[in-house]
């Protein structure tokens, strides 16, 4: 079999509040009931895990309480939101999808979404 295809947008600009959202879509070769989604950040060949969630098809994604990620799922599509981003967090955010159950296991890795984060300028002091 070929690698499971995972599609995600090439570029996303974070909002002024440091929030970025993007869709991660995977072409499921089978009828998975349990899916694991991991967001990885790649910068200068260093890769770190940003967040991860396992969900049952038809149910909500559940990230850890202290996660900077939230998300919803619809069919083979996952809508991911990352918050608390700052300029130093600019990088390539890669969606990794694993079909955990039932067997066989499948793994697909997206080509990444380049998220640009621009720290807002501080508001100038007002005379009023």
């Amino acid at each position: 079999c070929k690698a499971m295809h995972v599609a995600q947008p090439a570029v996303v600009l974070a909002s002024s509040r440091g929030i970025a959202s993007f869709v991660c879509e995977y072409a499921s070769p089978g009828k998975a009931t349990e899916v694991r989604v991991t967001v990885l950040r790649q910068a200068d060949s260093q890769v770190t895990e940003v967040c991860a969630a396992t969900y049952m098809m038809g149910n909500e994604l559940t990230f850890l309480d202290d996660s900077i990620c939230t998300g919803t799922s619809s069919g083979n599509q996952v809508n991911l939101t990352i918050q608390g981003l700052r300029a130093m967090d600019t990088g390539l955010y890669i969606c990794k999808v694993e079909l955990m159950y039932p067997p066989p296991y499948y793994l697909g890795i997206g080509n990444g979404t380049q998220i640009y984060v621009i720290d807002p300028e501080p508001c100038p002091d007002s005379d009023f």
Partner: nanobody
Framework: EVQLVESGGGLVQPGGSLRLSCAAS????????IGWFRQDPEKEREMVSC????????KYADSVKGRFTISRDNSKNTVYLQMNSLEAEDTAVYYC???????????????????WGQGTRVTVSS
Amino acid sequence: EVQLVESGGGLVQPGGSLRLSCAASGFSSDYYDIGWFRQDPEKEREMVSCIRSSGGSTKYADSVKGRFTISRDNSKNTVYLQMNSLEAEDTAVYYCGLAPISPVHAVCNQHYFGYWGQGTRVTVSS
């Protein structure tokens, strides 16, 4: 279905050599990273060595540099790990892993691996 089958493990004396083989099947992409990892009961699984299918970029753990050599035979979909000057600290179960990456992905990063073989045990002891 992706399958990775390791062979070549065994018992060897310190200073000896072994050659591990990993035969991959069920995966038709021309682009992937494939490598060797090891794990013993007290430790996390660690990457030993890895090679990229296209271009042949390689990576080695510091602890095995100069002693281990990874190579591949794309016609047989097989990757080899030649292990020389083996030490007691090399004792572990060795796993073959595959990462279905593309050119944008960092070479041989453990986060991208997900397909694993069953493992082959290497014991270095006198």
